[in-house]
């Protein structure tokens, strides 16, 4: 039975040209995290495998940095980066947990962080 929950940074906004940290946290489970996938819509951004380490997709190599932790740092943001991001936690023996973050990249300097929320 899957008892865990994923807490994410929720809906966030950032300035064009700036950077943002995408962060998820899996709690309420003793399951072992074997791999975390970061995806933007249906595109793979990065993978962190417990045994094999980090892999950043070639098309994002110059703008995506691993960490902190299992999170992901997006740099040199453009308005095209606006959209949904998913952290997918592969765990043993529970299975897969998915968290969603919505990022809005703003032209102006009025970017604010949204509230945190939980996905069961």
């Amino acid at each position: 039975m899957m008892t865990g929950t994923i807490e994410t940074t929720g809906n966030i906004s950032a300035e064009k040209g700036g950077s943002i940290i995408l962060q998820c946290h899996l709690s309420s489970t003793t399951a072992q995290v074997t791999q975390v996938n970061w995806e933007q819509q249906d595109q793979l951004l990065a993978i962190c495998n417990a045994d094999l380490g980090w892999h950043i997709s070639p098309s994002f190599k110059d703008r995506v940095a691993p960490g902190p932790g299992l999170g992901l740092t997006l740099q040199s943001l453009t308005v095209n980066d606006t959209g949904e991001y998913f952290c997918i936690y592969h765990t043993y023996p529970d299975g897969t947990y998915t968290g969603r973050i919505f990022l809005e990249v703003l032209e102006s300097s009025v970017a604010e962080h949204g509230a945190r929320f939980q996905i069961p």
């Epitope: 791999q35 993978i47 380490g53 592969h90």
Partner: antibody, heavy 121, light 108 residues
């Protein structure tokens, strides 16, 4: 062209160990991950583990953890799979398979010809 | 782990006919992290399709893959004599990477 050539068939007694080799050619050996998959007679395919390009990183299926060891020798472009504490259920054809991508994508693009390992007393 | 169930177990068809093979996952395979392999007796498997629908290098266009989520299909538009073999689906979304039990396509 890309080729993976495996060592010959082995017959082992229960409790023994076996070491199967997989020699790669036709590509940059240090750029790709290598998987190992086995197939028991008349059965389907079972992923065992994967080893990184430098040999520094490995990941094993839970089922084989502690019994399988993957290593690689860059000087000879060879990957090795050692399975210990053999039992009759380990009788199978063992395949090495090169990953399709520059990481452990899990897509097994090129396969060795297979090595039959028979475990019998 | 993700369990893949293939159906039917055996498909009896004649050359020239269309073959439709099914693969169902026990949980959603995001972004179509699914591959298909062909295996002939005494030979190693051969990669046919990855990403659910992308053909591997050198694979003829009579082979096509489709589907997303939990339901995937491999279609062989017109069976050639060399296509009679066992076909396996495989997910590479969630480790450990797993294979289906296979579908045997045999000559009717």
């Amino acid at each position: 062209q890309v080729q993976l050539v495996q060592s010959g068939a082995e017959v082992k007694k229960p409790g023994a160990s076996v070491k199967v080799s997989c020699k790669a050619s036709g590509y940059t050996f240090t750029s790709y991950y290598m998987h190992w998959v086995r197939q028991a007679p008349g059965q389907g395919l079972e992923w065992m583990g994967v080893i990184g390009p430098s040999g520094a990183s490995t990941s094993y299926a839970q089922k084989f953890q502690g019994r399988v060891t993957l290593t690689r020798d860059t000087s000879t472009s060879t990957v090795y799979m050692e399975l210990s504490s053999l039992r009759s259920e380990d009788t199978a054809v063992y395949y090495c398979a090169r990953d399709h991508s520059d990481y452990w994508s899990g897509i097994m693009e090129v396969w060795g010809q297979g090595t039959m390992v028979t475990v019998s007393s | 782990e993700i369990v893949l169930t293939q159906s039917p177990g055996t498909l009896s068809l004649s050359p020239g006919e269309r073959a439709t093979l099914s693969c169902r996952a026990s949980q959603s395979v995001r972004s179509s992290y699914l591959a298909w392999y062909q295996q002939k007796p005494g030979q190693a498997p051969r990669l046919l399709i990855y990403g659910a629908s992308s053909r591997a290098t050198g694979i003829p266009d009579r082979f096509s893959g489709s589907g997303s989520g939990t339901d995937f299909t491999l279609t062989i538009s017109r069976l050639e004599p060399e296509d009679f073999a066992v076909y396996y689906c495989q997910q590479y979304f969630s480790p450990p990477w797993t294979f289906g039990g296979g579908t045997k396509v045999e000559i009717k």
